[in-house]
Structures are given as C-alpha cells and as structure tokens.
C-alpha cells in the first residue's frame, strides 16, 4: 500500500545538524552557511505501528538513497544503524519493526523512540562531530529532542 511521506532535515535541540560520516553512519555537528547543504535529507514515512494514544509510527530513510535507519542488537546492545534496502520495495506501509520509530511530539520538539526497543531513542552527544546513536536514557547528558524542517524541492 502507498504511504504518506515527506522530505525533511532534523536538528537536535542544541541546533546540531546531521550529516553522513562514511557510508553507514550519521554524525551531529554545528553547520553554518553553505555547509548546511551537507546535512542529510530524510524521507520520513508514515507506517504501521502499535496502537498508542499519541505516538506516530514512522520510518526514516535517506532521500534518494536506499538506506533506512534501523535498530538491531549488536553485542547484546540496541544499536542504531543505516541499512540498505531494495528500493523497489521501500517504503511500504508494513515496515519491519527494526525500521519503525515512534515519533513523539511535545512542544514542537520531536523524539524518535525505537519500536523494536521501547525507551531507546535516537540520540546525539553533547560533543561535536560524534555519531548519532540509540540511547537508553532520556533527560540525561545525551540529547533526544529534535526539530524538523521541511525541505523545499
């Protein structure tokens, strides 16, 4: 079934942008001016998820790339990765659970909770130029709040 999708960028609550760091990793750093063109454009899709009062299930692909953020166990720890998919089959309404994030919107800030690993969130470090990762704490040192900006084509 077709899905509703949009193109956007994400910045963490410290205004760090997300950029590619090698072929399968994202990192967060402050960008200005023309460097803003480096930031990753996401294709965010509305997908099927668990019933909930106010969590909205989404998948986060990289625009015009066959890469999706996914959550898997590595060395017994929930881990965020970029995973290649067959572009003929994605996005789709019934995404595999590892690709699904519960978008939680509070006061214009977004959190992205892993559907596969509840209470684990897409996170960035306070430090500059560090990988985007899956974190198991909210409200601590690591940043789990993001803002979204539509991308005009």
């Amino acid at each position: 079934a077709p899905v509703r999708s949009l193109n956007c960028t994400l910045r963490d609550s410290q205004q760090k942008s997300l950029v590619m760091s090698g072929p399968y990793e994202l990192k967060a750093l402050h960008l200005q001016g023309q460097d803003m063109e480096q930031q990753v454009v996401f294709s965010m899709s509305f997908v099927q998820g668990e019933e909930s009062n106010d969590k909205i299930p989404v998948a986060l692909g990289l625009k015009e790339k066959n890469l999706y953020l996914s959550c898997v166990l590595k060395d017994d720890k929930p881990t965020l990765q970029l995973e290649s998919v067959d572009p003929k089959n994605y996005p789709k309404k019934k995404m595999e659970k590892r690709f699904v994030f519960n978008k939680i919107e509070i006061n214009n800030k977004l959190e992205f909770e892993s559907a596969q690993f509840p209470n684990w969130y897409i996170s960035t470090s306070q430090a500059e130029n560090m990988p985007v990762f899956l974190g198991g704490t909210k409200g601590g040192q690591d940043i789990t709040d993001f803002t979204m900006q539509f991308v005009s084509s």
Epitope: P2, M44, Q48, E51, I56, E105, M148, Q149
Partner: antibody, heavy 119, light 108 residues
C-alpha cells in the same frame, strides 16, 4: 494569535479556475502540514488533500488532476488551485493544520471561503 | 479506499440524555479515528483523536472508544451546547483521510 484565514472564494463559471489562499498567523508553515477540506451546502465534510514539504502532496482520488495544493513559506500561505470546475465543486473550502505530522487530524481550522460554480 | 459509515444519520435527544454515535470503517484502521463537532456556519472542532484521547479543552462528558473497525462517541449527559453535527474521520488508514457522512443531533 494563532489563526488561519482563507480568501479567494467567489462565483466562477463551470470549466473555470480559481485559486484559494490560506494565510497562517501566530505560527510558521515551515514545519506544519496543511490540508484543505470542503463542505457542499447542507452536506458533510470532504477531505481534498494535504501538503507537507512542497514536493509531498496527497489528494483525495476525486481531486487528483484538477486540484493542486502548494505553499509559499515566505508568505506563510498555502494555496488550492482548482481547475475545470463543476457545479458539484460548489462548497465552503476550509484550510486546516494537522495536529501533528502524520496524525491525520486537524485541530486548527480557518473560517472557510465559499466557492460557487454556476453559469 | 476506506469508507467510514456513521449511524444514526440523525438523532433526537433531550438535555441530560446519554447519547451514543457509532462509526464503522470498511476495514481495520487500528485506533486511527477522530471525532469532530460542527455547528451551523462554523468550522469543525476536534473532540477526540486516536479513538479515545480527549482534545485540549473538550469537556469530560465526551468520550470515545473502539479499535479496528468499530468506534463509538458517547456524550454522558447532553448539554444545550452539544446540539450539533458530529463527524468521525479515519486519520491513518492509507493515504486518504476520509470523513463519515455525519450525525445530526437535534432537540427532541
């Protein structure tokens, strides 16, 4: 004050075109999803379509091809371009803001603008 | 395309009555359902989203329930301000966002 104001409605002949505008105040359209919903006189609500970023628009099946939603973020305005209008397009047209991205429901509505298609 | 069917189309009741309006989806939409109230000449007002969550500022006499394809809107004790038309809306089943045909609530 957070509000939406529609304009551009009026009388148009069958086969004609009309562009409706919806201007937002009190918030930025740069990260808001905006929809159009219409209501024919004495009838129910009918979803027309929705716009996210400028490349991501979705329409009711009956609206595809004749109706186009666009946005101008610099003017904080969303548009509904209606072509090949028919008598059955006569309705009050509302713009509305999606409560959250992909929530599908609408918490903020404009006052509506009446479009009458008649010769 | 998912079709939303409300019943009854019209309903007459008195102040203080308990009122139930039902909405049926042509296929499962989980809990992706909203309810709106509309008064003549006015824009709709969101009452309930995700089948059972009360929108901000909506009185607690309104409640919603259901999941899958069957949903209900209940007004526990009808007030004079509640006479209006009520619409259900599928908010998440596929690309289309469909409304029910409406239920007009009138004074008995």
């Amino acid at each position: 004050e957070v509000q939406l104001v529609e304009s551009g409605g009026g009388l148009v002949q069958p086969g004609g075109s009309l562009r409706l505008s919806c201007t937002a105040s009190g918030f930025s359209l740069s990260d808001a999803a905006m929809a159009w919903v219409r209501q024919a006189p004495g009838k129910g609500l009918e979803w027309v379509g929705i716009i996210y970023d400028s490349a991501s628009t979705y329409y009711a099946s009956w609206a595809k091809g004749r109706f186009t939603i666009s946005r101008d973020t610099s003017k904080n305005t969303v548009y509904l371009q209606m072509n090949s209008l028919r008598a059955e397009d006569t309705a009050v047209y509302y713009c509305a803001r999606e409560r959250q991205i992909f929530s599908g429901d609408f918490v903020l509505w404009g006052q509506g603008t009446l479009v009458t298609v008649s010769s | 395309e998912i079709v939303m069917t409300q019943s009854p189309s019209t309903l007459s009741a008195s102040v203080g009555d308990r009122v139930i309006i039902t909405c049926q989806a042509s296929q499962s939409i989980d809990n992706w359902l909203s309810w709106y109230q509309q008064k003549p000449g006015k824009a709709p007002k969101l009452l309930i989203y995700r089948a059972s969550t009360l929108a901000s500022g909506v009185p607690s006499r309104f409640s919603g329930s259901g999941s899958g394809a069957e949903f209900t809107l209940t007004i526990s004790s009808l007030q004079p301000d509640d006479f209006a038309t009520y619409y259900c809306q599928n908010t998440g089943g596929g690309i289309n966002i469909a409304f029910g045909q409406g239920t007009k609530l009138t004074v008995l």
